[in-house]
């Protein structure tokens, strides 16, 4: 099989002319194409890859919201030579973008790297941008973080900046297959220089919860805030963290959890985040809306294809 | 259909700068990667400069660095090329190109820069 | 010097069938890069005849047929006709330039 070989950041590397033909291996039946974009209220971008790959012929489309800051991926397969080049890498204008002036800035101030490299995007080199409120929504928060993708065993990733809804989210993020975008959110201007060393506690919020070990052979009970999850046995050296959720009204789901119970060691998880169950790779953390097939891509909808690992 | 329609090329002394301009027509201009291409009198074509449909990629050829500036302007449908400190070999017909299916699928008529004392 | 090696002149008489060679190096063909060729009627602008090593834009007509081996390509044009007397060049992106390369350009001419 001959597959057409690219890996784009931004709007470079899968542009018309530096497209490659390769041969895939034995074994291999599948070309593959796998498109990620990343809308920010002042612009849009996007990561791709193409190459020969792995799994079974067929389409995934899916849009994804996180804190206001919107990704869409998608995923084509195919089993014929040079097939993987039928999804479109060029993006539609965002209609915000290049039209901020037209927008009332709110008072919060963000670094924002959209579609710039790693080393464009470090600490206060990226350009200032101010906030506003977009199609009914508060931008009043900063966000720092990631998107990645991976196809055709190739991990592209680009990091992610501007304003968001959310300005408490920590190490939050929304998965496709093979897809992610991830980050934190914080308050007050330019507070999103780095926020990878975030830790889960709010100066609001109550920090760590430590769990004392059982000392009588009587279960003990705790009171979980609503949460009808509770804390399955643990190593005696394991702490406990109690992750309070941030999210607002407008992104909760039913099914969230108040309390979310990281274990360090080998204990599985109790809690966690409650994803979207069901679609192959999917999960993500709870509250998180999936748009899934209905804005961008309507009408495109086609085999969900197995996703080899969520993100 | 699709058109590019060059202008801005003429006479200038070495040294000298000219801004070309290329109109495009019939197409998403917004969507498209651009490039100038050109020719000098009797000999081949050589690629010069290359800008991505945002205009956040550039790339130039190394015997125009630093001279030269591909520019875009979305709104208004319309590719520049800026060139300073002009040299006797930059004269030549300048194509602006549209990149389509991995190539250069449309072209302009050209411009002619002729660069003399 | 270009990067992309083609013979100055190639020439046929109409009906024939002619291959014009472009040689490259592991830097753009070698390295998968995929080829186009142009052609350049005399007084004209470039003209794209074939995209991604063998492909035909609309209105191209089949006796003209492009190939892709290791670092070189070729363009062969069978049932050769007088319109067909022109520049043919052929182009791939290069690594060590970041930018497309051309050959330099072969004038083939149909004699008779």
């Known amino acids: 099989l001959e597959c057409y070989s690219c890996v784009q950041k931004a709007d470079d590397g899968c542009s018309p002319h530096r497209m490659k033909t390769v041969k895939c291996g034995p074994g291999v039946d599948v070309c593959t194409e796998a498109v990620g974009a990343v809308e920010t209220i002042h612009g849009q971008f996007s990561v791709a890859v193409r190459g020969c790959g792995s799994g079974i012929p067929g389409k995934n489309d899916r849009g994804l919201d996180l804190h206001g800051l919107l990704a869409f991926f998608q995923l084509q397969q195919c089993s014929e030579d040079r097939c993987n080049a039928k999804l479109n890498l060029t993006l539609r204008g965002l209609n915000p973008a290049g039209n901020e002036s037209a927008y009332e800035p709110n008072g919060a101030e963000c670094y924002s790297c959209v579609g710039l490299s790693r080393e464009k995007c470090q600490g206060s080199m990226p350009p200032v941008v101010n906030c506003y409120n977009a199609s009914g929504r508060v931008y009043k928060g900063c966000f720092d973080g990631n998107v990645t993708l991976t196809a055709a065993n190739v991990t592209v990733s680009l990091p992610v900046r501007g304003c968001v809804q959310d300005e408490t989210c920590t190490r939050d993020g929304v998965t496709g297959p093979g897809f992610t975008l991830s980050g934190s959110c914080c308050q007050g201007p330019r507070c999103n220089a780095d926020l990878r060393n975030k830790t889960y506690f709010s100066p609001r919020i109550p920090p760590l919860v430590l769990l004392p070990p059982p000392t009588t052979a009587a279960p003990s009970t705790r009171a979980q805030n609503s949460s009808s999850t509770t804390s399955t046995a643990a190593p005696t050296t394991t702490t406990s963290i109690i992750k309070p959720t941030t999210a607002q009204a407008s992104h909760t789901s039913p099914h969230e959890m108040d309390l979310e119970v990281i274990q360090e060691e080998g204990a599985s998880l109790s809690g966690g985040a409650a994803g979207h169950g069901g679609t192959a790779g999917h999960g993500g953390a709870a509250g998180h809306q999936d748009r899934s097939n209905m804005e961008k891509y309507p009408g495109k909808g086609g085999a969900q294809i197995p996703a080899k690992g969520g993100s | 259909e699709v058109q590019l329609l060059e202008s801005g090329g003429g006479l200038v002394q070495p040294g000298g700068s000219l801004r070309l301009s290329c109109a495009a027509s019939g197409f998403t201009f917004s969507n498209a990667w651009m490039s100038w291409v050109r020719q000098a009198p009797g000999k081949g074509l050589e690629w010069v400069s290359y800008?991505?449909?945002?205009?956040?990629?550039?790339y130039y050829a190394d015997s125009v660095k630093g001279r030269f500036t591909i520019s875009r302007d979305n709104s208004k449908n319309t590719l520049y090329l800026q060139m300073n400190s002009l040299r006797a070999e930059d004269t030549a017909v300048y194509y602006c190109a549209r990149e389509g299916l991995w190539a250069f699928d449309y072209w302009g008529q050209g411009t002619l820069v002729t660069v003399t004392s | 010097q270009s990067v992309l090696t083609q013979p100055p002149s190639a020439s046929g008489t109409p009906g024939q069938r002619v291959t014009i060679s472009c040689t490259g190096s592991s830097s753009n063909i070698g390295a998968g890069y995929v080829v186009h060729w142009y052609q350049q009627l005399p007084g004209t602008a470039p003209k794209l005849l074939i995209y991604?090593?063998?492909k035909r834009p609309s209105g191209v007509p089949d006796r003209f047929s492009g190939s892709k081996s290791g670092t070189s390509a070729s363009l062969a044009i069978s049932g050769l006709r007088s319109e067909d007397e022109a520049d043919y060049y052929c182009a791939a992106w290069d690594d060590m330039l970041n930018g497309p390369v051309f050959g330099g350009g072969t004038k083939l001419t149909v004699l008779g």
């Open positions: 800008i991505s449909s945002s205009g956040s990629t550039i």
């Open positions: 991604d090593n063998n």
